[in-house]
């Protein structure tokens, strides 16, 4: 988790001096509490949107945007810690919107936005906005929390982001596999215009379970440049198991973006259909 | 937590025989296809060997006749025997389990002339 690269983050708006600093999301007000503290956030809304670097590079961000309630404690808004942990890892960063004037009630309700949080393909996030003062230990909470999934990178947006490209996803390897006589799959794909090598990775499962019954791994050297761009064709042995009928074949590249850890792709292959049973045929009809 | 560990590297004159192993923890090793990749300073992760599920073997060319890769289901290791080794075998070895995509830390393997 990080912040974008943004010159100068800033928080103010018209009637409103505010600066955005870093936070620990230790807020004093939790060690101090205070006797009048605000009232939580409202409508908070959480939404992708894409952001360049100084240098130039997309990366996808968490937009982050809320109201406040027109009641008589934004005279007691200090300001707002917003914090986003990231599930999978427990990872949190925070942000501290401190205010350096009174907010005073106007024509229109006060909304907030903040987009420089980067978040990362096909992750899920928790994101807290926490009104300041936090308020005393036995008192109404006044923060709003939303969880926030990332779509990942075969999304139209998100594959021409830095961190999608840089894990391969403007390569469209367009498998296809074929089921062949004795226990054979040829496997094709478009190779990309790199000289890495690539693995194959069969796994087989019998019909309708996830617990497979057969892994190959076949490793393919890396292509001389005329080969870019044409197809490679791989012939794989299946085990010979009764049932072991359902096969996945995944591709990894090794890309010098990504090294070990590129964006996969893969294509299923099906169990035969069974031919329906035939209704047995009674031995007499009857007359009715 | 998974964790895959690599042993067995060190330096050894060319000609001669090291064994690597990888032992799993937090998973097994039984039904999955093992590999064995290497990395030489500079260089991309070379592919070296492979087992399947079943126990059949895969081998780069560079290191037919001279590798041999072995699994142990029961032990949850992984070894590659590397026998007459050549100075071009330098290298740090990993172990990788491709379908969870796990690697090891990896090993140093140095071959002296």
């Known amino acids: 988790l990080r912040l974008l690269d943004h010159r100068a983050l800033v928080c103010s708006q018209p009637g409103l001096n505010c600066t955005v600093k870093n936070s620990t999301c230790l807020d004093d007000s939790w060690i101090h509490p205070r006797n009048l503290t605000p009232s939580s956030p409202k409508d908070l809304q959480i939404q992708l949107h894409f952001a360049h670097t100084q240098q130039g590079d997309l990366f996808p961000v968490a937009h982050i945007e809320w109201t406040l309630q027109t009641d008589a404690s934004i005279l007691y808004l200090e300001g707002a810690e917003l914090s986003v942990l990231q599930l999978n890892t427990n990872e949190r960063l925070c942000v501290r919107f401190e205010f350096l004037s009174k907010l005073r009630h106007h024509h229109r309700r006060w909304r907030f936005t903040f987009s420089h949080f980067v978040v990362d393909p096909d992750q899920e996030y928790e994101v807290t906005v926490h009104h300041l003062p936090k308020p005393i230990p036995d008192g109404d909470p006044n923060h709003q929390s939303k969880n926030f999934l990332v779509p990942d990178c075969e999304h139209a947006r998100m594959k021409v982001t830095t961190p999608c490209m840089s894990s391969g996803s403007l390569w469209d390897p367009n498998i296809t596999v074929e089921t062949l006589e004795a226990h054979q799959l040829r496997v094709s794909f478009t190779l990309w215009n790199e000289s890495t090598h690539y693995q194959i990775l069969l796994t087989s499962f019998p019909h309708m379970e996830n617990h497979s019954c057969f892994e190959h791994m076949h490793h393919i050297p890396a292509p001389r440049p005329e080969e870019f761009h044409q197809r490679s064709n791989v012939t794989l042995t299946l085990r010979n198991l009764k049932g072991c009928c359902r096969h996945q074949v995944q591709i990894q590249p090794f890309f010098s973006s990504c090294l070990n850890d590129c964006l996969r792709h893969s294509a299923t292959v099906s169990c035969p259909e069974m031919p329906d049973t035939p209704e047995p045929i009674p031995d007499y009809m009857p007359l009715w | 937590e998974v964790q895959l560990v690599e042993s067995g590297g060190g330096l050894v004159q060319a000609g001669g025989s090291l064994r690597l192993s990888c032992l799993a923890s937090g998973t097994t090793f039984s039904g999955r296809a093992v590999a064995w990749y290497r990395q030489a300073p500079g260089n991309q992760r070379d592919f070296v060997a492979s087992?399947?599920?079943?126990?059949?073997?895969n081998y780069a060319d560079s290191v037919k006749g001279r590798f041999t890769i072995s699994r142990d289901n029961a032990k949850t290791s992984v070894y590659l025997q590397m026998n007459n080794l050549k100075p071009e075998d330098t290298a740090v070895y990993y172990c990788?389990?491709?379908?969870?995509?796990?690697w090891g830390q990896g090993t140093q393997v140095t071959v002296s002339s």
């Open positions: 990788n389990v491709p379908f969870y995509n796990y």
């Open positions: 087992t399947n599920s079943a126990g059949s073997t």
